[in-house]
Interface confidence: medium
């Protein structure tokens, strides 16, 4: 059977495309074809005679097509236009007439596209911003990147216009991205320049740092502020509630005591209209700012259950600190048996239980700083344990609780509560 | 109706020129290629020029390289070859026609016109 297959089916204009021609049959007198889907003279393209090889122009030639001797039509510099069926007449030496129709399409070779958007400078959850892919063109698809990356799905992206407008509902700063649209249809593809969108945000509340509270005397004051902010912020410093200065950093040499009190930087951005402010209490001391280690000094390490007590110290040079008792990572004390004396130094057990057997150590702070102690090893022991709380394993003996006494692992689970109190030691 | 018209043929010596036109009628030559091909007795046809107008293209055969130059007038509708440095091989009819411009085939002969190199 006649058939007429297009090479390429979608082409582009400004290209070719070539109507070729299968099972075309033998003994020919000649062929025409014409635009559309069936013979109509006002509609030949071109007709050719095989004796004498020569083409002949219809109404319809444009001086774009060639006929070949196989009768497949080239049709170059292709036109909008020319899309659509085109039909192949095939006159046989009997004068039997056979006829076959194909088609091809026509796409336009995409422009370059851009992108128009309806606000240079959206402003943090509050602006929209609407991307709209340049120019419009029938037939294409428009597809979007953000920072060369599919669209990510979100509630606050829609797409609207056949894809061709991409908007941004309640812009956040996460959203300045580089952004590109691409137009595509079945013979070219084409992306545009990228457009960075420039969110408007800020200031945030502002980080003063170093985050230190507490100063010496005589030492250096330097406080920097900062807050995320576009554009930039304007920084400006309060001390006590009266403005200082209008930059980002703050200064003061040689400090005394009457410089401490509150240092307010207060953060201010002109274009969203939008101002923050942190509070930072500054305390210029005499206070040491490094602690020393202490040392513990036990009257007995090693003690008899139910009979001894015992007292820790918690020896320091160290003045203006407080002092508290850790054992098993719990503050003490924890029990009626337990007291602190002399301003928390001493940590007296009486009488000593099977429980209180484990680590203890002290740690000494103040307002600026704090170290702790080596930590030291109670043991406690008992004379005469009832033998039927005796196992022996291996030889070994081992107390295993009974009438209600728990194992000397599992006894400390009981929560701590901190006691503070405020030693002051005089050389 | 749709003519092509060859002109410009005739006698000249080996190494001289001759400038051969081709007016157009019945469509734009801005649409489509034309090239100018030859025929001469016992020697295959030979196509040894195209211009694309509407690509922006010229192409050649070897034989002609460096000798031969298409161009065209969109304004006149008219195909022109200029030849120099003729060569007595180069005796041939040279026909107008509507070529492909990528594919070894050609329509709608004018009647042409004879170039004749010979001393």
């Known amino acids: 059977k006649l058939t007429i297959e297009s090479t390429p089916f979608n082409v582009a204009e400004g290209k070719e495309v070539l109507l070729l021609v299968h099972n075309l049959p033998q003994h020919l007198f000649g062929y025409s074809w014409y635009k559309g889907e069936r013979v109509d003279g006002n509609r030949q393209i071109i007709g050719y005679v095989i004796g004498t090889q020569q083409a002949t122009p219809g109404p319809a030639y444009s001086g774009r097509e060639i006929i070949y001797p196989n009768a497949s039509l080239l049709i170059q510099n292709i036109i909008q236009n020319d899309t659509g069926f085109y039909t192949l007449h095939v006159i046989k030496s009997d004068l039997v007439n056979e006829e076959a129709t194909g088609q091809f399409r026509v796409y336009p070779e995409l422009p370059k596209p851009s992108i128009s958007s309806n606000n240079s400078k959206p402003v943090e959850d509050k602006d929209a911003v609407a991307f709209t892919c340049e120019p419009e063109t029938q037939d294409a698809t428009y597809l979007w990147w953000v920072n060369n990356q599919s669209l990510p799905v979100s509630p606050r992206l829609q797409l609207s216009n056949g894809n061709r407008t991409l908007t941004l509902f309640n812009v956040t700063r996460n959203d300045s991205a580089s952004y590109k649209c691409e137009t595509q249809n079945p013979v070219s593809a084409r992306r545009s320049d990228s457009v960075i969108l420039n969110v408007l945000y800020g200031p945030d509340t502002p980080t003063i740092s170093p985050s230190d509270t507490y100063y010496r005397p005589g030492a250096n004051l330097s406080l920097s502020c900062y807050a995320a902010s576009n554009p930039p912020a304007q920084y400006s410093w309060l001390i006590n509630g009266t403005f200082q200065q209008s930059t980002q950093e703050l200064f003061i040499p040689n400090i005394t005591v009457n410089n401490s009190g509150s240092y307010t930087c207060h953060a201010n951005n002109s274009v969203t209209g939008c101002n923050r402010t942190t509070v930072k209490t500054i305390i210029v001391t005499e206070l040491s700012p490094v602690v020393a280690k202490p040392q513990i000094k036990a009257s007995k390490t090693t003690v008899t259950g139910d009979k001894d007590s015992v007292n820790l110290t918690c020896s320091t040079n160290d003045t203006g600190i407080s002092i508290r008792w850790f054992f098993k990572n719990q503050s003490l004390p924890s029990s009626e048996r337990m007291k602190l004396s002399q301003g928390n130094i001493t940590l007296s057990i009486n009488p000593v239980k099977r429980e209180d057997a484990g680590t203890y150590w002290c740690e000494v702070f103040n307002p600026i700083s704090k170290n702790q102690s080596d930590p030291i090893m109670l043991n406690v022991n008992y004379n005469a344990l009832p033998q039927e709380n005796l196992i022996n394993v291996d030889e070994q003996l081992y107390f295993q609780g009974g009438s209600g006494l728990n194992d000397i692992f599992e006894a400390q689970k009981i929560e701590w509560h901190e006691a503070r109190a405020h030693h002051h030691h005089h050389h | 109706e749709v003519q092509l018209v060859e002109s410009g043929g005739g006698l000249v010596q080996p190494g001289g020129s001759l400038r051969l036109s081709c007016a157009a009628s019945?469509?734009?030559?801005?649409?489509?290629?034309i090239g100018w091909v030859r025929r001469a007795p016992g020697k295959e046809e030979e196509l040894v020029a195209q211009i694309c107008q509407y690509h922006g293209s010229t192409r050649y055969a070897d034989s002609v390289k460096g000798r031969f130059t298409i161009s065209a007038d969109t304004s006149k509708n008219t195909a022109y070859l200029q030849m120099n440095s003729l060569r007595a091989e180069d005796t041939a009819v040279y026909y107008c026609a509507i070529v492909g411009q990528n594919y070894p085939v050609y329509n709608y002969w004018g009647q042409g016109t004879t170039v004749t190199v010979s001393s």
């Open positions: 019945g469509f734009n030559i801005k649409d489509t290629c």
